[in-house]
Amino acid sequence: PEPPTACREKQYLINSQCCSLCQPGQKLVSDCTEFTETECLPCGESEFLDTWNRETHCHQHKYCDPNLGLRVQQKGTSETDTICTCEEGWHCTSEACESCVLHRSCSPGFGVKQIATGVSDTICEPCPVGFFSNVSSAFEKCHPWTSCETKDLVVQQAGTNKTDVVCGPQDRLRA
């Protein structure tokens, strides 16, 4: 028969022959021959290959370096890489999560719109009229101004985006 020019899925062409690829978690030791199928060996401890492949070396699992604020989120297997995430209070600097930075805090006048996660930073928003934040925080939202009326009090000092209103007693007319 004519030697093939293309092979099926999960095969590769070598020496005019279609050989089976190694399954995920295994590396290539020897190409197939006329007499034997492809020979593969499992990846070693702390190694992986995540596709059908003809790689002669497995990839090393990612190292979650605690000096960079990283910790293991999901341990790698022979078929998957280790997934790193950041320690509490830190988040990844990139999608690959190779290092971490401290979550930013929202300054006074800004509140937390979205709390940071291991992979995303804090999202701040300016406190709108009627709301304030007087602290620098990675957790605090903008708080609504105190309603003096509900306390039978009157506004003595207007609130800002950084300060609450100051309530005081109503002035009574003397008879």
Epitope: K10, Q11, C19, S20, C32, E34, F35, T36, E37, L41
Partner: antibody, heavy 113, light 112 residues
């Protein structure tokens, strides 16, 4: 012409080791894996393992892991199989074969006190 | 491991007869749409095995055309159309699809 030349018979004591050579000629040694096969007296054939001379990686039949070690010397186009901790169960003819197409003449290993 | 079962164990024949040897594997020898790595060997007394047929039906170089192989999946047959005296010996089937490679127990072709 492809030839695989094995050494003569070996008489070894129980507990000892033996290293059997298989000298290849007539082809490029690194182009083909070398397989090793055991044949006990009047019995069938058992595949021990093979070695890829390109990367020196061996694959073993689980049954012979720890019993056999396969190596190659590319400079002399020779494959070796070492058998250790020999017992009477290891008495057999051992063949080297170039991917089963070409076979050595076999080496008889007799384990006896 | 893949178990290779050969039938019969012994096959008495007369010179000029047709002979058939069966080999069955415990699992399919087709892997990932690839070749079917089923081979036949002849071992004459005091000699090493010689490859006759590879990949079910391909005659190895120098093998006479009275030898033929057939089969698929798990069932395979070696046929010798007209047995000659030099064909006597033990025939082994073997698989090279699943590591560890394994051999059948052998079929002894002998004169009736």
């Amino acid at each position: 012409e492809v030839q695989l030349q094995q050494s003569g018979p070996e008489l070894v004591k129980p507990g000892a080791s033996v290293k059997i050579p298989c000298k290849a000629s007539g082809y490029t040694f690194t182009d083909y894996n070398m397989d090793w096969v055991k044949q006990s007296h009047g019995k069938s054939l058992e595949w021990i393992g093979d070695i890829n001379p390109n990367n020196d990686i061996s694959i073993y039949n689980q049954k012979f892991r720890g019993k056999a070690t396969l190596t190659v010397d590319k400079s002399s186009s020779t494959a070796y199989m070492e058998l250790r901790s020999l017992t009477s169960e290891d008495t057999a003819v051992y063949y080297c074969a170039r991917r089963f197409a070409y076979w050595g003449q076999g080496t008889l290993v007799t384990v006896s006190a | 491991d893949v178990v290779m079962t050969q039938i019969p164990l012994s096959l008495p024949v007369s010179i000029g007869d047709q002979a058939s040897i069966s080999c069955r594997s415990s699992q399919s020898l087709v892997y990932s749409y690839g070749n079917t790595y089923l081979h036949w060997f002849l071992q004459k007394p005091g000699q090493s095995p010689k490859l006759l047929i590879y990949n079910v039906s391909n005659r190895f170089s120098g093998v006479p055309d009275r030898f033929s192989g057939s089969g698929s999946g798990t069932d395979f047959t070696l046929r010798i159309s007209r047995v000659e005296a030099e064909d006597l010996g033990v025939y082994f089937c073997s698989q090279g699809t699943h590591v560890p490679w394994t051999f059948g127990g052998g079929t002894k072709l002998e004169i009736k």
